[in-house]
């Protein structure tokens, strides 16, 4: 058993049929010695008396808010949560496996630049009695500070018969060094509590590996005289690191109709302009990627050919 | 070239060669990007490689003030990785595929280090740790980790030379 926060404790249980469970001793936070009784949740049934209460925690029915009273007055609470371990593996029932970029990916994180600011998100089908708490650091043995905000519900989607809820959190490295080569990864830890179930999820990454620039901005077209060709120009996204002579991007320019199966014109460039062939009912799209490190491409920025 | 007197390197040449290094480092093992090698107990391996750190003057301001500190750090790293790529980690079993770009990568690391340091001038170089894994699978894992680390190192070096070529070239 360990303390998650004040008056909230996590009991780690090996979860299998007829498991013996864990013996837990609760102590009432009071100077009083006599006349103390214990109850669980809303029940008035007295579970025991005395300053300490010893219980065998085996299942969710044994978890909950234990309260010690004296003469009708509440003295203190202890909330017990369960953390299940099945076949040596901690349960992951609360969050959905996003399966990208690999199986058992529960947390996904992205950064728009090298400033040390990043966003992580996760998915669940649970809509109520759900809380998250996020901590992060650079490195684990001698951790350097990363400050995370509160996790918030950022999107709701309908997936078949189920509703899916996306939560996200923004974090900022306290002393970021955008130009340096990272040697220690960022660690992100998410505590998830659903009713009386506790789970924790972690992710470890370098900012450079989670970079995904915003799409290029201000796409403009200039038809070339006596030609089917069009000069398309764009700018670096505002959110990208500066100076651009140091933090350079490379671009992919594509002309395509509405369907992905349609024919296309495609060209790669390090410049902020390119010449392509525009077709009626097609769009010109441009996306960006770090020029020197193969992290994710941005989403496309598009303008219609006409 | 970065010479003892502290004159400028051939920024544009360094830029071209460092960009080539980036391409080669990724083609040497593109799938490295999809392997979570941190799960495999990194500390004893890649913590020994030289990293371009915050105080090394490789940021735009540091380069403007005095690029020599940064260039020396990059040179150290190039020599370090060049030696690693020539060591039995890469030459031993399992043999690299004949079409592996590691050979080109090795030659390009040497080429860029020579651009930075001409004959007769020697910056101190970092000692290569004795990383001699006994098992072929350990060697394979070590290669992945070294290449992964090299990808990050050459990316910073390429940024430095691109910025130098754009803003510091005479």
């Amino acid at each position: 058993i360990w303390e998650l926060k004040k008056d909230v404790y996590v009991v780690e249980l090996d979860w299998y049929p007829d498991a013996p469970g864990e013996m837990v001793v609760l102590t009432c936070d009071t100077p009083e010695e006599d006349g103390i009784t214990w109850t669980l949740d809303q029940s008035s049934e007295v579970l025991g008396s005395g300053k300490t209460l010893t219980i065998q925690v085996k299942e969710f029915g044994d978890a909950g808010q234990y309260t010690c009273h004296k003469g009708g007055e509440v003295l203190s609470h202890s909330l017990l949560l369960l953390h299940k371990k099945e076949d040596g593996i901690w349960s992951t029932d609360i969050l959905k496996d996003q399966k990208e970029p690999k199986n058992k990916t529960f947390l996904r994180c992205e950064a728009k630049n090298y400033s040390g600011r990043f966003t992580c998100w996760w998915l669940t089908t649970i809509s109520t009695d759900l809380t998250f708490s996020v901590k992060s650091s650079r490195g684990s043995s001698d951790p350097q500070g990363v400050t995370c905000g509160a996790a918030t519900l950022s999107a709701e989607r309908v997936r078949g018969d189920n509703k899916e809820y996306e939560y996200s959190v923004e974090c900022q490295e306290d002393s970021a060094c955008p130009a340096a080569e990272e040697s220690l990864p960022i660690e992100v830890m998410v505590d998830a509590v659903h009713k009386l179930k506790y789970e924790n999820y972690t992710s470890s990454f370098f900012i450079r590996d989670i970079i995904k620039p915003d799409p290029p901005k201000n796409l403009q077209l200039k038809p070339l005289k006596n030609s089917r060709q069009v000069e398309v120009s764009w700018e670096y996204p505002d959110t990208w690191s500066t100076p651009h002579s140091y933090f350079s991007l490379t671009f992919c320019v594509q002309v395509q109709g509405k369907s992905k199966r349609e024919k296309k014109d495609r060209v790669f460039t390090d410049k902020t302009s390119a010449t392509v062939i525009c077709r009626k009912n097609a769009s010109i799209s441009v996306r960006a990627q770090d020029r020197y490190y193969s992290s994710s491409w941005s989403e496309w920025a598009s303008v219609p050919c006409s | 070239r970065a010479v003892p007197g502290g004159s400028s390197p051939a920024w544009t040449q360094c830029q071209q060669l460092s960009q080539k290094l980036c391409t080669l480092a990724w083609s040497a093992h593109p799938l490295v990007g999809h392997m979570d090698l941190r799960e495999e107990g990194d500390e004893e391996t890649t913590n020994d490689v030289p990293h371009i750190q915050c105080g090394d003057g490789c940021d735009p301001q540091g380069l403007r003030d005095n690029s020599q500190f940064c260039l020396q750090r990059i040179h150290q790293g190039l020599i370090f990785y060049e030696k690693l790529l020539g060591s039995d980690i890469f030459t031993g079993e399992p043999s690299l595929l004949p079409d592996s770009p590691v050979g080109q990568l090795h030659a390009s690391l040497l080429g860029l280090s020579q651009l930075l340091q001409p004959e007769g001038h020697h910056w101190e170089t970092q000692q290569i740790p004795s990383l001699s894994p006994s098992q072929p699978w350990q060697r394979l894992l070590l290669r992945f980790k070294i290449l992964r680390s090299l990808q990050a190192f050459v990316a910073v070096a390429a940024r430095v030379f691109a910025h130098g070529a754009a803003t510091l070239s005479p």
Partner: antibody
């Protein structure tokens, strides 16, 4: 599968014109760009231009501008390349090729030998 | 127009050996570079597109790398059917241009 079958060899006199055909099969004709590339005997490859069968748009290499015309007939899924004012250095194998991507050549015809000789 | 230069013009290699073919562009073309193989009396066939992407059905011994102005086609272990002429082609800008070719012959 995608296939391009070209017309047979031609012998022409200098100053004449030649029209080479290229019949496509195995795909929707308007879904691919069509290019023409030529190769003089013992020489390298030379791009001549492209046509979009969907709308008839064309782009020709400056070297051939004014001397070449590329057309298509969607009813027969056939592309044509006409080269006028032939000279002896136009002697070459002329290839048509098709791709969904505009700028490189995935599927090639077998080639048509055009000999220009007086 | 962009001039593509291939080297060497002829490469003599023994079967089973590695062949490295070079292609240089007269200006930076990012990764807009494609490789073709042509055997005598046949049309060329696409091997590699956008510098390093392998065409489906092409043996894994063919690989491409490079960006900017310098590109390489590597054939790791030459088989008898690989002796042919290899062309690079740039697609950075029109007109599309080819290199002069590298003939890979049996040593």
């Amino acid at each position: 599968q995608v296939q391009l079958v070209q017309s047979g060899a031609e012998v022409k006199k200098p100053g004449a014109s030649v029209k080479v055909s290229c019949k496509a099969s195995g795909y929707a004709f308007t879904d691919y760009y069509l290019h023409w590339v030529r190769q003089a005997p013992g020489r390298g490859l030379e791009w001549m231009g492209w046509i979009d069968p969907e709308n008839g748009d064309t782009e020709y290499a400056p070297k051939f501008q004014g001397r070449v015309t590329m057309t298509t007939d969607t009813s027969t899924s056939t592309a044509y390349m006409e080269l006028r004012s032939l000279r002896s250095d136009d002697t070459a194998v002329y290839y048509c090729n098709a791709n969904k991507e505009l700028r490189y050549f995935d599927v090639w015809g077998q080639g048509t030998m055009v000999t220009v000789s007086s | 127009e962009i001039v593509m230069t291939q080297s060497p013009a002829t490469l003599s290699v023994s079967p089973g050996e590695r062949a490295t073919l070079s292609c240089r562009a007269s200006q930076s073309i990012s990764i807009n570079l494609h490789w073709y193989q042509q055997k005598p009396g046949q049309a060329p066939r696409l091997l590699i597109y956008f510098a390093s992407q392998s065409t489906s059905g092409i043996p894994a011994r063919f690989s491409g790398s490079g960006s900017g102005t310098e590109f390489t086609l590597t054939i790791s272990s030459l088989q008898s059917e690989d002796f042919a002429v290899y062309y690079c082609q740039q697609s950075n800008s029109f007109p599309l241009t080819f290199g002069g070719g590298t003939k890979v012959e049996i040593k």
